[in-house]
């Protein structure tokens, strides 16, 4: 006979039961897998020279044996010759010193005989009316159980609890939930209505976070805007980690607090998506826009408190990157293009009205024009930037406009709307004698000077009315005064001032006549 099979022959010893009190006892046999079985027993008495035989009789009338030697445990498969679907009777005969001792017989259907297991696999944990509810699938063929739990916190020892009787395909247990500390739970089962039967092993730990996730204590810093129009958000202080019970200190699923970053891009409200949530470990790159950043802590019971920070817009402006041409049909902006098929968001807002919502327009994805420029145009009728005031313009770009973290700043600049040529004309031009051959010309600042980077320069023009000779004097945009020298006494002059932008010549102010009186000596 093969060792893996039950041997259908007479056993190799005489069947002489000694009837002594010692010998094999507590035989139990059960299924341990879909096709595997196990029998185990105790042996009372001296074990030297004892050979064990697991005997089995089938309902067909045939009997067989497994010789196990000194071992008191045997595993066999459903291919070993023992009928697992029909009733069999099993016992152990232990042979030593020419005598045989028998265990009591057990009669069962092996396939249906299952050793009670603890809850296995996925134990679902939920919150129910301030308590913890655990639920799991009843192990196969084990409906009808009583269940106990034990639990501990990082600072306490095990406490035992009762889940009550279970009689369904799913079993559950209500357990205490701690508000602010993590807990470790384990469960065990035994056959219902068999108080003398042994408990299963304890289940694997079920790690449960506190009901309230901890408040995230973190700090951020944001780097300077790079040449690619993006700046990195970095975490300066990590959130503190939760203290865990002993069995949950490895990679224990269920107890962890996850921290997520919720990013809300305040600029460019016309884009497709304004909010994005991402893991705290994955710190994003941001455009130069203004953002609100929230850190949300959550555990298996849901989100907890959050902390919100405001990241202001990057105020660095590019004075020359934007070219604006105003024609009879309307206005066109030009700027250095990004890659092929880029979507641009053009946002503008009157200076001084930063609290109000900015106006914005999203372009269709566009490729660079032959000069490498991207453009955006609008008609005069649209009224866009039509008022004669200073506007802050920001242009953002993205090849993936629906992905919030892939926007970058192309440029940020200022533009004077409406008829800037006329609106920017300096007023209150005045001339004062300065010396015998010079005058000081003063004027009120142009409206263009309220728009950073827009006013390129003032030009002061002086015309000699006798000779019709004209001289022009450029003046820094920060200055509102110039001294005209080498003038001749008694000659009539006219002076005018204009304010120029990078792309537009301003309109001259009203001519102002003056002359230097001829000095008569006494």
């Amino acid at each position: 006979c093969r060792t893996s099979e039950c041997c259908f022959q007479d056993p190799p010893y005489s069947d002489a039961d000694s009837g002594s009190a010692s010998g094999p006892r507590d035989l139990s046999c059960y299924r341990i897998s879909s096709a595997g079985y196990e029998c185990s027993w105790q042996y009372e008495g001296p074990t030297a020279g004892v050979s064990h035989f697991l005997r089995c009789c089938l309902s067909s009338g045939r009997c067989c044996y497994f010789a196990t030697g000194s071992a008191t445990r045997l595993q066999f498969s459903d291919q070993a010759g023992v009928s697992v679907l029909h009733t069999v009777t099993l016992w152990v005969e232990s042979w030593a010193r020419n005598r045989t001792e028998k265990s009591p017989e057990v009669t069962l259907q092996l396939y249906k005989s299952v050793k009670y297991k603890p809850p296995l696999g996925d134990i679902k944990v939920s919150k129910l009316a301030g308590q913890l509810r655990m639920e799991w699938e009843t192990p196969d063929n084990q409906v009808g159980a009583e269940v106990q739990f034990r639990h501990r916190t990082p600072s306490s020892s095990w406490k035992l609890g009762d889940c009550g009787p279970q009689d369904d395909d799913t079993e559950s247990c209500l357990c205490p939930l701690e508000m602010n500390v993590a807990q470790e739970f384990q469960l065990r089962r035994r056959r219902l209505g068999s108080q003398g039967s042994s408990w299963s092993k304890w289940s694997s730990p079920v790690c449960v976070p506190p009901e309230n996730p901890p408040q995230p204590q973190v700090r951020f810093s944001v780097e300077q805007l790079g040449r690619d129009g993006r700046r990195r958000l970095t975490l300066k202080e990590q959130p503190t980690q939760l203290e865990l019970p002993e069995g949950c200190q490895g990679p224990a699923p269920g107890v962890e607090v996850t921290y997520q970053l919720q990013l809300h891009m305040l600029s460019c409200p016309c884009k497709a998506k304004a909010t994005r949530t991402l893991p705290l470990e994955k710190m994003p790159y941001l455009s130069g826009a203004a953002y609100n950043v929230a850190v949300i802590s959550s555990n298996r019971f849901g989100p907890g408190p959050n902390q919100t920070w405001h990241i202001p817009a990057d105020t660095h402006t590019e004075p020359v990157a934007l070219n604006i041409s105003v024609g009879t049909n309307g206005t066109t902006m030009y700027w250095p293009a990004r890659a092929q098929s880029t979507t641009y968001c053009i946002e503008w807002q009157p200076v001084g009205q930063e609290g109000s919502l900015a106006t914005c327009n999203l372009t269709a994805p566009q490729d660079p024009d032959p000069a490498g420029m991207a453009t955006y145009s609008w008609s005069r009728e649209s009224g866009a930037m039509g008022q004669e005031k200073c506007y802050h313009i920001t242009i953002f770009a993205s090849a993936h406009p629906k992905k919030l973290t892939l926007w970058s700043t192309v440029l940020s600049t200022y533009h004077f709307g409406g008829n800037a040529s006329a609106a920017g004309t300096p007023h209150h031009v005045s001339v004062k004698n300065h010396s015998l051959d010079s005058v000081s010309v003063d004027w009120a600042p142009s409206l263009l000077s309220t728009c950073p980077g827009v006013l390129k320069e003032y030009v002061v023009r002086c015309r000699d009315e006798d000779s019709n000779q004209v001289s022009e004097h450029p003046v820094q945009p920060t200055e509102t005064q110039v001294t005209l020298s080498d003038l001749r006494a008694g000659v009539a002059y006219t002076v005018q001032v204009r304010a120029d932008t990078a792309w537009l010549r301003g309109a001259w102010s009203q001519p102002q006549r003056f002359s230097i009186k001829v000095q008569v000596s006494d």
Partner: nanobody, 126 residues
């Protein structure tokens, strides 16, 4: 000397009941599988019911299933046959037999058994 002694037979009306006993001596009773056979006049001895040494398994011939029950009490070294709903065709001499439980625990033929009793008569009248 091994002895198996049957008792409990007698005359009974159809539909009635009887309980047969077989007391064993001179052997370690709990080492033996036990069986009941019967033999009607002019017929061969036939297997009726069998039981393993511990009583965990039983086997019956189809004609008595649901009507007869075999049991044993190892403390009293006795095997029983409870016979209910008796029919006239159950009339026979009933024998108790014992066999060591080696590679089989019952045989449908008498030659597989080591020890036999003298038999007890059961007569069912209609």
């Amino acid at each position: 000397e091994v002895q198996l002694v049957e008792s409990g037979g007698g005359l009974v009306q159809a539909g009635g009941s009887l309980r047969l006993s077989c007391a064993a001596s001179g052997l370690t009773f709990r080492n033996y599988a036990m069986a009941w056979f019967r033999q009607a006049p002019g017929k061969e001895r036939e297997f009726v019911a069998g039981i393993t040494w511990g009583g965990g398994l039983t086997h019956y011939v189809d004609s008595v299933k649901g009507r007869f029950t075999i049991s044993r009490d190892n403390g009293k070294n006795t095997v029983y046959l409870q016979m209910n709903s008796l029919k006239s065709e159950d009339t026979a001499v009933y024998y108790c037999a014992g066999k060591t439980q080696g590679s089989t625990w019952y045989h449908l033929t008498p030659d597989g058994y080591d020890y036999w009793g003298q038999g007890t008569q059961v007569t069912v009248s209609s």
